[in-house]
């Protein structure tokens, strides 16, 4: 219907605008008029899809009128000025504000020109990750927990680990209406090898510039795993002192080391020094099985080592340490 040459007047606006719950947001909307075109704007109108009436109107002589005057404001439209900018500010965003809005210009001689804008109401979630301290169970159990609280829409949680494991993710309504709290558990069969290793919780959300990465240091409580080192099956009479070490991995840390032999207490040539056992030089061959017993809060475990001190001069390359 408009006269020839008037088809180029268009309304410019983004198709989608994000805004944060409780904050204010501007819905941008402009009338784009090419240089050679003539247009006169008398009214700016905002309406929400599915609702009766308009929520905001800027009239050439009456100025602005709003359905909710405390929550809406024309950003740039002024009485006596050209009405080319219909941008509307919304204050105190609520979940129910999410939806489709129409921005409309009443123009002459082109007629009405409008565009639709989708307002997306977001809530930025708070993210935490924590270890779930476990004992050896033989069954898969949650070993780490990642929580994204109060997001809109719900955050996406994924786990990254070289250890395998399975996620178990659930959602519940957040404290604020329309928000969601997402909880993800990382599940694995606990083992001592996993203790102290890291897994990463990755949280993705529309409101983040980039994903948030939260690292969890795993904790597995287990009794001591014990071995004895320092013996190379190549000890001879007349050699200098040697040292055996009781190597224990445990969580929590060992609380005590106890050295003994299968025959009972340590012989005189063996002196216990905590996790180490000092072997003094001997003048006759021996064949003794030594025991290291390590205790932590979860129990005690032991390791045995049979030590032989043989006759004959030590070779240049005997494998024992000399002091």
């Amino acid at each position: 219907w408009p006269p020839p040459g008037t088809g180029d007047v268009v309304v410019q606006a983004p198709t989608q605008v994000p805004g944060f719950l409780g904050d204010s947001v501007t819905l941008p909307c402009y009338l784009q008029v090419p240089n050679m075109e003539v247009t006169h704007v008398s009214q700016l109108t905002w309406a929400r899809h599915g609702e009766s009436g308009s929520m905001a109107v800027f009239h050439q002589t009456q100025g602005p009128s709003y359905s909710e005057s405390k929550r809406l404001e024309f950003v740039a439209a002024r009485l006596g000025a050209e009405l080319r900018n219909a941008s509307l500010r919304m204050f105190g965003l609520r979940v129910e504000d999410e939806g489709n809005y129409t921005c409309l210009f009443v123009t002459f001689p082109q007629g009405s020109r409008s565009v639709d804008i989708w307002l997306r109401v977001l809530a930025k979630p708070q993210n935490t990750a924590e270890v779930q301290k476990v004992q050896l169970t033989g069954e898969p159990v949650p070993m780490a927990r990642c929580v994204s609280t109060g997001g809109r829409p719900p955050a996406q949680i994924t786990w990254h680990s070289d250890l395998g494991g399975m996620p178990n993710t659930s959602q519940v309504p957040g404290f604020l209406s329309g928000t969601v709290t997402v909880t993800s558990l990382w599940i694995l069969v606990p083992s001592s090898q996993v203790d102290g290793k890291n897994v990463t919780c990755k949280v993705e959300h529309e409101s983040f510039e980039k994903p948030q990465l939260l690292t969890v240091n795993l904790t597995v409580y287990y009794p001591p795993e014990v071995s004895i080192s320092g013996y190379d099956n190549n000890w001879y009479l007349g050699q200098n002192e040697a040292t055996l070490t009781c190597d224990a991995r445990s969580n929590p840390e060992p609380t005590g080391y106890n050295w003994s032999t299968t025959m009972g207490p340590l012989p005189p040539f063996a002196v216990a020094q905590g996790a180490q056992l000092l072997i003094r030089p001997v003048d006759k061959p021996i064949n003794t099985t030594l025991i290291c017993n390590v205790t932590n809060a979860l129990g005690a475990r032991q390791a045995e080592l049979t030590v032989q001190v043989k006759e004959g001069p030590p070779s240049e390359h005997s494998g024992i340490s000399r002091n």
């Epitope: 006269p3 009214q43 009239h59 050439q60 409309l104 009443v106 009405s112």
Partner: antibody, heavy 116, light 107 residues
Framework: EVQLVQSGSELKKPGASVKISCKTS????????MHWVRQPHGKGLEWIGG????????SYNQRFKGRVTLTVDKSTSTAYMELSSLRSEDTAVYYC?????????WGQGTLVTVSS | DIVMTQSPSAMSASVGDRVTITCKAS??????VAWYQQKPGQPPKALIY???YRYSGVPDRFTGSGSGTDFTLTISSLQAEDLAEYFC?????????FGQGTKLEIK
């Protein structure tokens, strides 16, 4: 105070033309589009067309098939409507009206009677 | 052209009555609807713009509502000076069109 004052009544013969004036005051003439609406006696309102005084841009109701011409004189803040090839069914009160999307101010009306 | 169908075409009511006039558009006009009051021998006077917003100086007993295709003008408590004809108008697209009018008489 915004005022739109129209010229007086006209009696015309079929086939003739009529030109009605609408002198404005109380506002900046070039900031508002001027439209014309007619109303046959005891009947409804019919939009004829509009003109933007600044650039002379016009829009017409196709029903008038090129019989109507809208013009302005910016120096006197006056709008004009000329209707040609008059017929008896053009007998009506013709109004000028200031456009604000709707029409917020109207002239007092000019009665045009077409009769042989 | 968009056809605006107004009803009733005429009605009478008593002072203090609540009066409702409706206007139906033949296609979606959003909220681009105005209402006018025309007293005998006078030009129309603008009451409502954008379907629901009152012009300054218009008594608040006049209320407009609606969007899309269905619109209503309500006079909450009729006064003697409201004796007039009422018209709706769409300004969504050219050619602008009016309802045929509702003549309101006072009983």
């Amino acid at each position: 105070e915004v005022q739109l004052v129209q010229s007086g009544s006209e009696l015309k013969k079929p086939g003739a033309s009529v030109k009605i004036s609408c002198k404005t005051s109380g506002y900046t003439f070039t900031e508002y589009t001027m439209h014309w609406v007619r109303q046959p006696h005891g009947k409804g309102l019919e939009w004829i067309g509009g003109i933007h005084p600044n650039q002379g841009e016009t829009s017409y109701n196709q029903r008038f098939k090129g019989r109507v011409t809208l013009t302005v004189d910016k120096s006197t803040s006056t709008a004009y409507m000329e209707l040609s090839s008059l017929r008896s069914e053009d007998t009506a009160v013709y109004y000028c009206a200031r456009w604000t999307g709707d029409f917020d101010y109207w002239g007092q009306g000019t009665l045009v009677t077409v009769s042989s | 052209d968009i056809v605006m169908t107004q009803s009733p075409s005429a009605m009478s009511a008593s002072v203090g009555d609540r009066v409702t006039i409706t206007c139906k558009a033949s296609q979606n006009v959003g909220t681009n609807v105005a209402w006018y009051q025309q007293k005998p021998g006078q030009p129309p006077k603008a009451l409502i713009y954008s379907a629901s917003y009152r012009y300054s100086g218009v008594p608040d007993r006049f209320t407009g509502s609606g969007s899309g295709t269905d619109f209503t003008l309500t006079i909450s408590s009729l006064q003697a000076e409201d004796l007039a004809e009422y018209f709706c108008q769409q300004y969504e697209s050219y050619p602008y069109t009016f309802g045929q009018g509702t003549k309101l008489e006072i009983k």
